[in-house]
Interface confidence: medium
């Protein structure tokens, strides 16, 4: 089993649609179960996010340049939700996403009809096959949702978007 998300980072506009792509190949002849999971950014400082002293965390980040303090932390330190699952042709949305225009298309791509304020974060594409357990069964993409901002007004296309005040 091999799962690949081609875009490691995706930027999309608030209240616009987007598609998070996911490809997989498998030796199984059984239908795969596709699940998309959302993980919010790590809200703590890097030391707290791994439950360690800041000195130890800093030495870890120096040794491992791939480690990102805002993406890599224990699930208990951030919000984790199932966005949608697909078995056969049946797509089921997670409780938090019910009522939203979200579906899984082209085998494993997550299609979101209208991006919302809290959609920024990490999205994991997880594939389960009953008789192909070897290989890589998940991959992730970081999604950043941008609204209409003066800072970018003359750098990005201007979309007519709204805001959800705190």
């Amino acid at each position: 089993l091999q799962v690949t998300v081609p875009d490691k980072k995706k930027v999309a506009m608030l209240f616009q649609p987007t598609v998070l792509r996911c490809h997989f190949s498998t030796s199984s002849h059984q239908p795969a179960v596709v699940q998309w999971k959302f993980k919010s950014y790590c809200q703590d400082r890097m030391g707290e996010s791994l439950g360690m002293s800041s000195t130890r965390a800093q030495s870890l980040s120096k040794r491992n340049l791939e480690w990102d303090p805002y993406l890599d932390c224990l699930d208990s330190r951030r919000t984790v939700r199932v966005v949608a699952s697909k078995q056969g042709s049946t797509v089921t949305l997670g409780d938090f996403y019910r009522g939203r225009e979200i579906t899984i298309v082209h085998d494993a791509d997550l299609q979101i009809g209208k991006l919302m304020w809290g959609d920024s974060g990490l999205y994991y594409c997880i594939i389960t096959t009953p008789d192909d357990l070897e290989g890589k069964n998940e991959d992730s993409v970081e999604l950043l949702v941008l609204g209409r901002t003066g800072l970018l007004a003359d750098l990005l296309p201007s979309f007519a978007v709204e805001i959800m005040p705190e």
Partner: antibody
């Protein structure tokens, strides 16, 4: 609670450059914009430019174009503002400010300020 | 560039009394999404500025409800329903519609 900690005061000669750092602790550096604002002695606030670290996109006020460079290092949650060809009128307190995306233009957290004195 | 004009320059107020600061922009700050790209900041003596109001009328987190922002297009007002001693400082309006982001000249609120 997010904190922005800036580097210390600097005294510079006219024609030289200064680089001020702004380190963010707490919160998520990935989902913020950082702006730099300066305040000359007894004067008001002046926006110099800003950056969205996750995109690496910076935007500068025309007044400072060619003299200012704003960068961000996501791995250390630190933003930098470098101002070159300094003149006496650049003497000011330089602030970094953080705005939360998806927007980012309203700055809910500010650094303590860095006084840059340009004098021969 | 959008020019921001504030008045008055100085505002002496008795504690417990209301206060009002006006801000005018050289072009409309109302965007097609229905929001006004106008923020208010307060800089207390010897401190960094702090956000009070964003997008015209939204109070920032932790800001007392005696502060309110109103207005649309080119004319905006910051109101303090009952001024307290801790409210002294310089108040700035700022437009966030387009770059360069620009500030008003500031209004100095002092206690009478």
């Amino acid at each position: 609670q997010v904190q922005l900690v800036q580097s210390g005061a600097e005294v510079k000669k006219p024609g030289s450059s200064v680089k001020v750092s702004c380190k963010a602790s707490g919160g998520t550096f990935s989902s913020y914009a950082i702006s730099w604002v300066r305040q000359a002695p007894g004067q008001g606030l002046e926006w110099m430019g800003g950056i969205i670290p996750i995109l690496g996109i910076a935007n500068y006020a025309q007044k400072f174009q060619g003299r200012v460079t704003i960068t961000a290092d996501k791995s250390t949650s630190t933003a930098y503002m470098e101002l070159s060809s300094l003149r006496s009128e650049d003497t000011a307190v330089y602030y970094c400010a953080r705005g939360r995306l998806p927007y980012g233009d309203f700055w809910d957290s500010w650094g303590q300020g860095t006084l840059v004195t340009v004098s021969s | 560039d959008i020019v921001m004009t504030q008045s008055p320059l100085s505002l002496p107020v008795t504690p417990g009394e209301p206060a009002s600061i006006s801000c005018r922009s050289s072009q409309s700050l109302l965007y097609s999404n229905g929001y006004n790209y106008l923020d208010w900041y307060l800089q207390k003596p010897g401190q960094s500025p702090q956000l009070l109001i964003y997008l015209g009328s939204n109070r920032a987190s932790g800001v007392p409800d005696r502060f309110s922002g109103s207005g649309s297009g080119t004319d905006f007002t910051l109101k303090i329903s009952r001024v307290e001693a801790e409210d002294v400082g310089v108040y700035y309006c700022m437009q966030a519609l387009q770059t360069p982001l620009t500030f008003g000249g500031g209004t100095k609120l002092e206690i009478r």
